[in-house]
Structures are given as structure tokens and as C-alpha cells.
């Protein structure tokens, strides 16, 4: 079939292929603190690591561009790391009549795979 | 609000930011000829280019990290250039009681954006 | 409806471990942390620590270092707190709460876990 | 720390009557824009606390007017225009601006 078999191994040795990490970062790193009150310090999930050949492939067309990388790496890039889904996040924010909580569906990675 | 205003002029210069290109690829560059048998010569739609700052981003998320790379690059990727969509290819293949025709919806990309 | 749900009481030996639950339900488990609070009987109210479900992350008190573990699991949707070495100091009600971040007001609370440590 | 000193430490009023208590911090609690992060609690006998107010001056969902925060920096103010005998209780000050997080002793409204 079209789907070879994704590894879930990492040949490159623990923690260099892709996989979800958390960052810490305030309100002013992301530009928000004018308008975030809480939290002001955020831990966000982010896909990092690198893809090597079937690694975490997110689909048939991650596959075929791992196999073609392989092929032309000067014109066809690797598969990267990016986000699979995400998890609801909550802030606090100013509002123009005071403060409202809102729920922000794509700020946090929930898992990683490579596309 | 959370959402900056993703940008869609490329500021490295024509054809160099996340874009889609055409690939040609053979059914042996694809490991796929015992048992696909049309089409041999396949014309793949692939997501290449850079992602400066804020370009196409995919979602929130994407923002924040393309701000946070700009931060800490060492530490977070800059986001990279996949699918956001994907259009059906129809293959004809070799089955153990013939040949048959299979769409497959994930197999060459339609559009792209930094995630 | 939004709510946490703690076991009414526990009645534990000095010396010995209990893990506390804090199962949540009505809203997304791994938007918002999860606090605990202490209140000794007839006393004021203590904050322990937080824990941020979405990655796990804790945050204690100095006052609890080496006494309070705080743990999730998300596929239940349920944080729980785990206190060692108990003596009759640590014979409180334990509430958990929930609040946006780590400086956010606890607008949900759960009914306490009334833990008694006796022999 | 940030220590949390409220006053009274109780008081005893008539229905009807209008109520403020105070509730002191060691340091400023005061962030961008004039957000305060000092929250006030209601705990009646046999229950959990209930959030009452947030960042100083906003009303939680479902809370009364009659409740109103006030004040900023280091001094807080909770003031229950009219009581009613429903708000016998026991009301906390906390403050989240900074790790960890810090409740006043409280003050006990008592309904004469």
C-alpha cells in the first residue's frame, strides 16, 4: 500500500527527534502583556526534534516527501515537526467593559508529527 | 487579540517563502512500482520555501512561535512550510484479483502554510 | 455543570501516605490548573501548590517541599495530591480548586477532603 | 512572602447595615493598567470558599452587587452595601501576584 510503516524510534539518539516540549514564556515575549492578565507566565507546548527518514510521518505525502528528500535533498526539504493537535488554553484578558476568559483552541501543541 | 496579522508578501524575495512547487517523481523514486501501475511518472504538489516572521502562519501557535524563535532560536524552531490542505490523487494498482482504482486523499498537497 | 469532586474524608495512620483526588468535570480538564488550599479546623486557609495538567508542571509552597507531591491523569481528567510522612499537623480539610494560571482567582472549588491522621 | 493582614478580625452587624473590611498587603500587588491581583473569598460554616471578587473590583458570575472591591496598590477595601443574614460568613483576601499565594487571617461578619 501507499503507507510504508512510520518508526517511532529515534535513530538519532533520546530527546533529537520530534517530539512536544514545554517553553516557558511571560506575556511580554509573546507581545500580549497589554492585553492578557492572566497567566502572565504561559507554558506552552511546542513541537521540536528533527524527522529523520519515516519518522512520526503524518500522513502518505510526509512519506513520499521523506523518500524524495532522500532522492533531491537540494529541492525537496525534509518532513519537519509540527503540531498533530492541539489543547484548549484559558486566559484572562481586558475587555473594553472589564475582563473576560477566553478559549483559544490552536495556542498549544498537544502532540507532534512530522509533515 | 491573540492574532497578529499573518503576512503574505514574501520579504526574501520571489519564490523564496513557503510556497507550492511541482515535483515529478517516478514510481522507482517512490519505491511504489510492484504494484502501482498508473500513473509512472507522478507530478507531486510539495510545500517548499522559508518561513520568515509571521508569514502564512497557520494559527496562533505559529505566531507564537515564529515571536519565540525570534527569542530563543536556539532553543525554538522557526515555524516551517507543510500542507494545509491536500487533494485527491486516483492510482491504478495491481490487487491480488486484479487491477482497481484508489483515491487518495493525502497524498499531494493543494495549498501551504507555516506551522 | 462545572465541577471537582474530592472524596469526603480519609482517615490515615501518622507515618503513613495519602493520595488525595480532585476529578474534574464540565470543562476542558487541561485548560486551567488545578490548586490546593489546606484549612486547619477553626483556622484561616493555606495555599499548597498548583498543577498544570496540560504538561504537568508543579508548583509548591516552601513550606510543603518534601511533603506534598501533585500528580494528574488526564485520561480521567482527575489531579491528585499526595502527602507524606503524616502527623497530626497535616490533619486539615484539603480543597481543590481551579484557576486560569498560577495568579489567577480559583473561581471553582471542590467540597474539601476532611483527612484526619490518628493512630 | 507577601503577608496578608485583614481587619477587622470580626464584626457583628444588623440586617440591612452597610459593611466594609479591610485587607492590607506588605508589598504593592499592583500590575499593568491598574489590575490589582487581589482576589476576596466567601466562606460560609460547613463549605468551601467561593470567589466573591477578582483582580480587586470585578464580581464573580452569580455574586450580588451589593459586593463590591476597591482599592489598589497595597490597601483593599470589601464592601457589602446592604447586609442580608445570608451573608454570615467568613471572608478571605488573597493575593496571586506572586509565588506563592497568600490568604489574610479573614474577618468573621456575624449578623446581630
Known amino acids: 500500500s501507499a503507507h510504508a510503516h512510520p518508526r517511532d524510534s529515534c535513530p538519532l539518539g533520546p530527546g533529537r527527534c520530534c517530539h512536544l516540549e514545554t517553553v516557558q514564556a511571560t506575556l511580554e515575549d509573546l507581545g500580549w502583556s497589554d492585553w492578557v492578565l492572566s497567566p502572565r507566565q504561559l507554558q506552552l507546548s511546542m513541537c521540536v526534534g528533527e524527522c529523520p527518514h519515516l519518522y512520526r510521518s503524518a500522513n502518505t505525502h510526509a512519506q513520499i516527501k521523506a523518500r524524495l528528500h532522500g532522492l533531491q535533498p537540494d529541492k525537496v526539504p525534509a518532513p519537519c515537526c509540527v503540531p498533530s493537535s492541539y489543547t484548549p488554553v484559558v486566559l484572562m484578558h481586558r475587555t473594553d467593559s472589564g475582563v473576560s476568559l477566553q478559549t483559544y483552541d490552536d495556542l498549544v501543541a498537544r502532540g507532534c508529527h512530522c509533515a | 487579540s491573540a492574532h497578529a496579522h499573518p503576512r503574505d508578501s514574501c520579504p526574501l524575495g520571489p519564490g523564496r517563502c513557503c510556497h507550492l512547487e511541482t515535483v515529478q517523481a517516478t514510481l522507482e523514486d517512490l519505491g511504489w512500482s510492484d504494484w502501482v501501475l498508473s500513473p509512472r511518472q507522478l507530478q507531486l504538489s510539495m510545500c517548499v520555501g522559508e518561513c520568515p516572521h509571521l508569514y502564512r502562519s497557520a494559527n496562533t501557535h505559529a505566531q507564537i512561535k515564529a515571536r519565540l524563535h525570534g527569542l530563543q532560536p536556539d532553543k525554538v524552531p522557526a515555524p516551517c512550510c507543510v500542507p494545509s490542505s491536500y487533494t485527491p490523487v486516483v492510482l491504478m494498482h495491481r490487487t491480488d484479483s486484479g487491477v482497481s482504482l484508489q483515491t487518495y486523499d493525502d497524498l499531494v498537497a493543494r495549498g501551504c502554510h507555516c506551522a | 455543570q462545572v465541577q471537582l469532586q474530592q472524596p469526603g474524608a480519609e482517615l490515615v495512620k501518622p507515618g503513613a501516605s495519602v493520595k488525595m483526588s480532585c476529578k474534574a468535570s464540565?470543562?476542558?480538564?487541561e485548560g486551567w490548573y488545578i490548586h490546593w488550599v489546606k484549612q486547619r479546623p477553626g483556622q484561616g486557609l493555606e495555599?499548597?501548590?498548583?498543577?498544570?495538567?496540560?504538561?504537568?508542571?508543579?508548583n509548591h509552597a516552601q513550606k510543603f517541599q518534601g511533603k506534598v507531591t501533585m500528580t494528574r491523569d488526564t485520561s480521567s481528567s482527575t489531579a491528585y495530591m499526595q502527602l507524606s510522612s503524616l502527623t497530626s499537623e497535616d490533619s486539615a480539610v484539603y480543597y481543590c480548586?481551579?484557576?486560569?494560571?498560577?495568579?489567577?482567582?480559583?473561581?471553582?472549588w471542590g467540597q474539601g477532603t476532611t483527612l484526619t491522621v490518628s493512630s | 512572602d507577601i503577608v496578608m493582614t485583614q481587619s477587622p478580625s470580626s464584626l457583628s452587624v444588623s440586617a440591612g447595615e452597610k459593611v466594609t473590611m479591610s485587607c492590607r498587603s506588605s508589598?504593592?500587588?499592583?500590575?499593568?493598567?491598574?489590575?490589582?491581583?487581589l482576589d476576596w473569598y466567601q466562606q460560609k460554616p460547613g463549605q468551601p470558599p467561593k470567589l466573591l471578587i477578582y483582580l480587586d473590583r470585578n464580581r464573580a458570575h452569580g455574586v450580588p452587587d451589593r459586593f463590591t472591591g476597591s482599592g489598589s496598590g497595597t490597601d483593599f477595601t470589601l464592601t457589602i452595601s446592604s447586609v442580608q443574614a445570608e451573608d454570615l460568613a467568613v471572608y478571605y483576601c488573597?493575593?496571586?501576584?506572586?509565588?506563592?499565594?497568600?490568604f489574610g487571617g479573614g474577618t468573621k461578619l456575624e449578623i446581630k
Open positions: 508589598q504593592s500587588l499592583l500590575w499593568k493598567h491598574g489590575y490589582n491581583y
Open positions: 464540565g470543562y476542558p480538564f
Open positions: 488573597m493575593q496571586s501576584f506572586e509565588t506563592p499565594i497568600t
Open positions: 480548586a481551579r484557576g486560569v494560571g498560577a495568579d489567577a482567582a480559583f473561581d471553582i
Open positions: 495555599w499548597m501548590g498548583w498543577n498544570n495538567p496540560r504538561t504537568g508542571l508543579t
